[in-house]
Amino acid sequence: CKAMHVAQPAVVLASSRGIASFVCEYASPGKATEVRVTVLRQADSQVTEVCAATYMMGNELTFLDDSICTGTSSGNQVNLTIQGLRAMDTGLYICKVELMYPPPYYLGIGNGTQIYVIDPEPCPDSDF
């Protein structure tokens, strides 16, 4: 089979600070040295890019400075963290993995992680 399998958890609950973390694991059919990981958000059949990073195997995963994502890599596993989430960001987050180099190129699309975000209740004013 020439398809690359990507596994990610079905559901994740964001913290009260709007932070969600999940693992994206891919079964590499080849010995990739350059990998690109993209987090996509799917809502009402519309797909948008949340963040993306390209890394060399054995090196750290580096997102752009203004990205809402951070991550670390270990072998064929990527630990992804998305920050600054609010209730309106609840949705399906898809992990996309591309083995860019060396040939052949492989594409892997995960089934998506449903991230639930609950906005914290505002603290009531205290009278002292």
Epitope: H5, V47, A52
Partner: antibody
Framework: EVQLVESGGGLVKPGGSLRLSCAAS????????MHWVRQAPGKGLEWVSF????????YYADSVKGRFTISRDNAKNSLYLQMNSLRAEDTAVYYC???????????WGQGTMVTVSS | EIVLTQSPGTLSVSPGERATLSCRAS???????LAWYQQKPGQAPRLLIY???SRATGIPDRFSGSGSGTDFTLTISRLEPEDFAVYYC?????????FGQGTKVEIK
């Protein structure tokens, strides 16, 4: 408007060269991989070449390897195909296509005709 | 290289009837990586189905895709006059990206 517009096609003699361009608009060009696909008269679709987001990774069909070079300029939202040592069998309509976020070619240009004949 | 074989080469159907197009791969293709395109004379191809069964934006629900592994199907439930065209399947899970040779759907 989200679109791709090819240019640069024409009539060229065998052994000659041609440079095709594809101008992208209406989307963040650097967030997508890009491809060239061709279609010989009355024939099916044939993938020609691929280029990664930053232009560092490139792949080619065996039929054009060593003769064609794909490149992109993200600052200009443009994709290119330099075609050298052209042969009669390279005669085709050449399309640029966007590799969609989930992989399929979700946006195509209108195509530009390349005719290789003496 | 994954070779895609489409059948039949030509399908003659009357408007309003159902059309069933087949695409067979030389080796297993993950269903997430199989697409169908429609092409009319003088026009660029248009994405219809991706991920074997998901309709692209703006594609009417009379178009549906199914299948997994090596066998995939595009079904047009009730052919409209504008559906007479050539249809191509494609795999995009690994390089080289490959297309089937196409099925022409013509008016009977």
């Amino acid at each position: 408007e989200v679109q791709l517009v090819e240019s640069g096609g024409g009539l060229v003699k065998p052994g000659g060269s041609l440079r095709l361009s594809c101008a992208a608009s209406g989307f963040t060009f650097s967030s997508y991989t890009m491809h060239w696909v061709r279609q010989a008269p009355g024939k099916g679709l044939e993938w020609v070449s691929f280029i990664s987001y930053d232009g560092n990774t490139k792949y080619y069909a065996d039929s054009v390897k060593g003769r064609f070079t794909i490149s992109r300029d993200n600052a200009k939202n443009s994709l290119y195909l330099q075609m050298n040592s052209l042969r009669a069998e390279d005669t085709a309509v050449y399309y640029c296509a966007r590799g969609g976020l989930l992989g399929p070619f979700d946006l195509w240009g209108q195509g530009t005709m390349v005719t290789v004949s003496s | 290289e994954i070779v895609l074989t489409q059948s039949p080469g030509t399908l003659s159907v009357s408007p309003g009837e159902r059309a069933t197009l087949s695409c067979r791969a030389s080796q297993s293709v993950g269903s997430s990586y199989l697409a169908w395109y429609q092409q009319k004379p003088g026009q660029a191809p248009r994405l219809l189905i991706y991920g074997a069964f998901s309709r692209a934006t703006g594609i009417p629900d009379r178009f549906s895709g199914s299948g997994s592994g090596t066998d995939f199907t595009l079904t047009i439930s009730r052919l409209e006059p504008e559906d007479f065209a050539v249809y191509y399947c494609q795999q995009y899970g690994s390089s080289p990206w490959t297309f089937g040779q196409g099925t022409k759907v013509e008016i009977k």
